[in-house]
Amino acid sequence: MRRGPRSLRGRDAPAPTPCVPAECFDLLVRHCVACALLRTPRPKPAGASSPAPRTALQPQE
């Protein structure tokens, strides 16, 4: 049984993730997690100290 592609990659898109489609790749911790648990870093505004909101992109099949 052939394993399907895990992600689609555009010219400037990030490298394909090692996650199965049921999970998302968390760029902060560099591994796959449930998509509800993502904690991907965003640039902080000056003087900000609170943790970044949970956002990230999940490649689809």
Epitope: M1, R3, A34, A36
Partner: antibody, heavy 118, light 113 residues
């Protein structure tokens, strides 16, 4: 063809231990996440956890309801993965299924029955 | 944990009838970044193991007859069987895989009159 075959079920006393096996064929075992799910007689399904693939270092996730008592592992050389169950209780009596995880729980084995009773 | 609630718990229909069953989650299963709903439907026939029917709430698994349709988004989902066949006698479960622990609904038992 994907095939998953569970074994190792049986009768065990409360407080005892049991190791279930899931023999895998039809796909590259190192390239897939594998999960365990159980179903008490006449009741709904309960997800127990899964073990990720080689690309993810075979890391695991567990249902808090069994974390600390149940351990998922794999022997890739023999295309088998395991569910080690310790300190078993009457409420652990169920049919235990292994399943391949991809889009969801894509393929399931036929199940093996565990009965915990004195 | 996300609680999955299915209704009705059972229903009896005649062959050829249309059936709808509901699944509600205690929180949204929609991931805004890709607009996917992390919800699956399974069919468990008597004495058999579950079989994946639908994933992403509405995508039919390969080989599943097109009389099975999944719909819905966010917290409310529906499985529809457009024209029931005798072989559809089973319990149908929904399951979320948006977060851990993955959780299942209590099931809807479909009986044939």
């Amino acid at each position: 063809e994907v095939k998953l075959v569970e074994s190792g079920g049986g009768l065990v006393q409360p407080g005892g231990s049991l190791r279930l096996s899931c023999a895998i064929s039809g796909f590259t075992v190192t390239a897939y996440y594998m999960s365990w799910v159980r179903q008490p007689p006449g009741k709904a399904l309960e997800w127990l956890g899964f073990i990720r693939d080689k690309a993810n270092g075979y890391t695991t996730e567990y249902n808090p309801s069994v974390k600390g008592r149940f351990t998922i592992s794999r022997d890739n050389s023999q295309s088998i993965f395991y569910l080690q169950m310790n300190t078993l209780r009457a409420e652990d009596s169920a049919t235990y299924y292994c399943a391949q995880v991809r889009r969801a729980l894509d393929y399931w084995g036929q199940g093996t029955t565990v009965t915990v009773s004195a | 944990d996300i609680v999955m609630s299915q209704s009705p718990s059972s229903l009896a229909v005649s062959v050829g009838e249309k059936v709808t069953m509901s699944c509600k989650s205690s929180q949204s299963l929609l991931y805004s970044s890709n607009q996917n709903n992390y919800l699956a439907w399974y069919q468990q026939k008597p004495g058999q193991s579950p079989k994946l029917l639908i994933y992403w709430a509405s995508t039919r698994e390969s080989g599943v007859p097109d009389r099975f349709t999944g719909s819905g988004s966010g917290t409310d989902f529906t499985l529809t069987i457009s024209s029931v066949k005798a072989e559809d006698l089973a319990v149908y479960y929904c399951q979320q895989y948006y977060t851990y622990p993955y959780t299942f609904g209590g099931g809807t038992k479909l009986e044939i009159k």
